[in-house]
């Protein structure tokens, strides 16, 4: 168990007297003090809180902290000229405008600076034209239209739900099927649960609650004009023409009020299916076009927002390690948000706060960890995690050598049902064995652990008795250290019955009624999830920063690889005729698969039996530890995405929020029927199933006896 | 506590004007659209004018469109109804009533009412 | 212009159940509200929404909705219930309407 020779508390007490020392009623204290006014990115606001935080965290005890800047490229309405959307009648005459800005909720009526919902970095433009509605404007959905339903969208509006995927691919998609704008807006079906009141009367979406957020399709790059370095005070920029991700099209969020009154007179084709159909009073019709009495009506959007590069600020807290100082455990959230932030990302945020809290009153009693733990508030995360992105880059060449693990702390909770566990399968032992050690806070168990509440509500959809633990995809700050850097990565927080509510997030997610009153009275009075979330996260860090061992096992990596090997070998087989005529072979992959769980078994059998004492031998045994998630990562980066270099996990290319696993050898063969030239598409499988037999069979060697 | 308390009205000539004013008290204002409704003696009720919360639209009955024009200020927490080119069917109680913005929760709070008469 | 059209009276005995039909051809795109109002008072929301109820609003009252017809059901009619009730609804226009008004008496 944890231990650690630089400490005056027992070393089986350590774990304990840092979970003791974390207090509910500190994390409501900070949820409060963090969401009174609100943090948007690059403003004074979120500057003044930047340095609150640095303060606090100082008197907390860390070593030092320390504000990193970066100049990027952030995307702002105008406040003169709002953006809205109007249905026009033959004369020009706008007939009916969406919203300015949402009903302020009670008690918040007289804050200034609240961004009025719009999507950040959508080009300026006044298109007009008629509407196709295009469900989640996922991959699927345009197949529908245009394979199926043969329906163009180009030259036209469309308007998609918000919903199942990252709102950055809608637009993608979007653009790629010729739309020359894009409305988003929340459908009760997706964001209103049955039987509860909308805010401020209950946790539901109303009608005039709108969801921001950036359009961006990054593909892990950071500031959209620094690709691959840091915004510092001497960098190049891009031109805006060659920056990274930005949409061509615009794009405006609107509520299911406004979505209704364009709806309603939707014509042309009847929805293909019923799944087409969200929980509006109206026909779902696809269109193109209003039906006949308003088929001379158009849709025209009206979009100022100005794209402009903004001073962002990073908080960097050290807590220098007694042993390994040289290695870094890192614990980073983000801090900016879109309002006030009471879910996102401040329920995060004051967990962070009150870990660093307790890691602080351990250190002025004479404790240390073994390995140093760096402590990280994130700026701009909003705007395609740019903060993060940025020091990173700024200090990859130390993260790459030094980076032991990246946990992250964004929101705290998205429901109170159960928890929910996305990390590297290098992890899964020390989540499991942390989770029997905590208490559940659920109702119907007390005296229980929370690994038994958790599997109970979440079980494994593979081994019984095991709680479910998902893939990292991305729209988080552990994008650029998992998926660009190769540094064990994992997140943790409170989640709702994904069974019985079928919406997507939660309903008020990055609107202006994320308040702290969302979240005090509705989700979580006690503050009890925070604070099992606190004891995840934070003990999770201290595991990670003061086990002799390293809490990683290498095993659970095999098991997932033969796993996901077999999945897209049964994907790849659906093509069986073409497997055959072009030698498509996953013999090589198997083969490395198998290597690799001879070899951590192996590894694993050392483990268990090298002489601790030896620091050389302790140093050497953890290095290969931390650097198997290394292992993985290709230089090269996969096709078109350089800034995703891990081969075994990626976001998906159709949901950025999804991991998707063997991305390389998944995309070769996605839609592969369609391919114009079939041998060059099958070509490209088999080189990418090449490119992950190689890595895996390499991964499996850095495990092997060094000598 | 919430309260909406109409004035302005009174006994007009055919073709002159009035205003009638709204005064809103016990809620938030700007997150409210606002309407007025009338109701003819011994007749039903008829709505008449709606305005958002955020001033981003106003609509009319057909039967006052080009005559009358909605208006508020929010500083004074006051919805307005300038009634021009008055017409006996103008003659009625006239109502305001506030009803949440961009939502579907109804015109839950209503004033007491204001009569307008117009007779020569 | 658009109408929504209801029955100008309904009788019924004390603890028996009231119907109040309101037709309109935007209801199945739109949603209905019901209004109570007393001689000499202002009208008060009864119905939201089609089917919602307003705190406040005893549970003998609801609503529902089908097609081109919403309907406001009072179970258990109590003497206090005698009253006119409005039904409202918009257009595709953004203009609102109400219906023609149902008198409802309890015998």
């Known amino acids: 168990k944890s231990s650690n020779e630089a400490t005056n508390i027992t070393p089986k007490h350590n774990m304990k007297a840092f979970l003791d020392e974390l207090k509910a009623e500190n994390i409501k204290k900070f949820l409060y003090n963090f969401t009174q006014i609100p943090h948007l990115a690059g403003t004074e606001q979120n500057f003044q809180l930047a340095k609150q935080i640095q303060s606090q965290w100082k008197e907390f005890g860390l070593d030092s902290v320390e504000l990193a800047h970066y100049d990027v490229l952030l995307s702002y309405p105008n406040k003169t000229h709002p953006n809205y959307i109007s249905i026009i009648n033959e004369d020009g005459n706008e007939i009916f405008n969406t919203s300015l800005f949402e009903p302020p909720p009670p008690g918040y009526e007289n804050v200034s600076d609240i961004v009025p919902p719009f999507s950040a970095f959508s080009p300026q433009g006044m298109p007009e034209g008629d509407l196709v509605y295009v469900n989640y404007a996922r991959t699927e959905d345009f197949f529908k239209l245009e394979r199926d339903m043969k329906i163009n969208c180009s030259g036209k509006i469309v308007i998609a739900r918000y919903g199942k995927v990252f709102r950055g691919n809608k637009v993608k998609n979007a653009q790629l099927a010729g739309a020359k704008g894009v409305i988003l807006y929340s459908d009760p079906a997706d964001y209103f649960a049955p039987g509860v009141k909308s805010y401020p009367d209950g946790w539901n979406l109303p009608g005039g609650g709108v969801q921001r957020g950036n359009i961006l399709n990054l593909n892990g790059a950071g500031d959209p004009l620094t690709p691959g370095y840091p915004a510092n005070e001497y960098a190049y920029r891009r031109g805006i023409a060659e920056a990274v991700g930005l949409p061509s099209i615009p794009v405006h969020p609107i509520g299911y009020y406004d979505a209704q009154k364009l709806l309603e007179k939707m014509g042309g084709s009847a929805p293909p299916d019923s799944s087409w159909r969200g929980s509006l009073k109206v026909p779902y019709n696809v269109g193109p076009g209003f039906t006949g009495n308003f088929s001379t009506q158009k849709v025209k959007m009206h979009i100022h927002s100005t794209n402009e590069v903004t001073r962002i600020y990073n908080v960097i807290g050290t807590l220098r390690g007694a042993v390994e100082p040289d290695r870094y455990v890192i614990l980073g959230g983000h801090r900016d948000s879109w309002v006030f932030g009471g879910i996102d990302p401040q329920s995060g945020a004051a967990v962070v706060h009150e870990i660093v809290r307790s890691f602080g009153t351990l250190k002025k009693e004479g404790w240390r960890p073994r390995r140093t733990i760096l402590f990280a508030s994130w700026d701009a995360e909003e705007f395609g995690l740019l903060g993060s992105t940025e020091w990173a880059e700024e200090n990859s060449r130390l993260l790459q050598e030094r980076g032991v693990a990246y946990i992250n702390a964004d929101s705290s909770i998205e429901g109170n049902y159960t928890l929910r566990v996305d990390c590297t399968p290098l992890m899964y032992s020390l989540v499991h064995n942390l989770t029997k050690e905590l208490k559940s806070p659920d109702e119907g168990f007390e005296g229980k652990s929370l690994y038994e509440s958790w599997t109970k509500k979440s079980p494994s959809p593979e081994f019984s008795g095991m709680p479910r633990i998902s893939k990292l995809g991305s729209g988080n700050d552990f994008e650029v250290f998992f998926q660009r850097l190769g540094i064990a990565s994992g997140r943790a927080r409170y989640t709702k019955n994904w069974e019985t509510n079928k919406f997507s997030g939660y309903p008020l997610y990055h609107s202006v009624y994320e308040t702290y009153e969302l979240v005090e009275k509705f989700y979580d009075p006690m503050f009890k999830y925070h604070l099992t979330v606190a004891q995840v996260r934070g003990g999770m860090v201290f595991e990670l920063a003061n086990s002799i061992v390293l809490p990683f096992d290498c095993r659970d990596y095999a098991v997932v690889l033969r796993k996901y090997a077999d999945k897209i070998y049964s994907i790849s087989m659906k093509h069986p005729q073409e497997m055959k005529t072009y030698s498509v072979s996953f013999d090589s992959l198997f083969s490395a698969v198998k290597n690799f769980t001879e070899i951590a078994s192996k590894f694993s059998e050392r483990l268990q039996d090298f002489d601790k004492s030896n620091p050389i031998v302790l140093r050497m045994m953890n290095d290969q530890l931390m650097f198997l998630e290394r292992a993985f990562i290709d230089p090269l980066g996969l096709p078109d995405r350089p800034f995703y270099r891990h081969v075994i996990y990626a976001p998906s290319s159709h949901n950025k929020y999804a991991g998707e696993s063997f991305p390389g050898i998944y995309d070769a063969l996605f839609d592969i029927e369609s391919k114009v030239d079939p041998s060059k598409a099958w070509g490209e499988v088999k080189r990418q199933i090449y490119v992950a037999a190689f890595t895996v069979q390499a991964a499996a060697e850095t495990l092997s006896e060094v000598a | 506590q919430v309260q909406l308390v109409e004035s302005g009205g009174g006994v007009v000539q055919p073709g002159r004007s009035l205003r009638l004013s709204c005064a809103a008290s016990?809620?938030?204002?700007?997150?409210?659209?606002m309407n007025w409704v009338r109701q003819a003696p011994g007749k039903g009720l008829e709505w008449v004018a709606i305005i958002y919360y955020d001033g981003s639209n106003k609509y009319y009955a057909d039967s006052v469109k080009g005559r009358f024009t909605i208006s508020r200020d929010i500083s004074k927490n006051t919805l307005y109804l300038q009634m021009n080119s008055l017409r006996a069917e103008d003659t009625a109680v006239y109502y305001c009533?506030?009803?949440?913005?961009?939502?579907?929760?109804?015109?839950?709070?209503w004033g007491q009412g204001t009569t307008v008469t117009v007779s020569s | 212009s658009y109408e929504l059209m209801q029955p100008p009276s309904v009788s019924v005995s004390p603890g028996q159940t009231a119907r109040i039909t309101c037709s309109g051809d935007?209801?199945?795109?739109?949603?209905a509200y019901w209004y109570q109002q007393k001689p000499g008072q202002a009208p008060v929301l009864v119905i939201y929404k089609d089917s919602e109820r307003p705190s406040g609003i005893p549970v003998r009252f609801s609503g529902s909705s089908s097609g081109t017809t919403v309907t406001l059901t009072i179970t258990g009619v109590q003497a206090e219930d005698e009253a006119d009730y409005y039904c409202?609804?918009?257009?595709?226009?953004?203009?609102?309407?109400f219906g023609t008004g149902t008198k409802v008496t309890v015998l």
């Open positions: 009533a506030r009803e949440r913005g961009r939502d579907y929760y109804g015109m839950d709070v």
């Open positions: 935007a209801l199945p795109k739109q949603y």
């Open positions: 016990g809620f938030t204002f700007s997150s409210y659209n």
């Open positions: 409202q609804s918009a257009d595709s226009s953004g203009t609102y309407v």
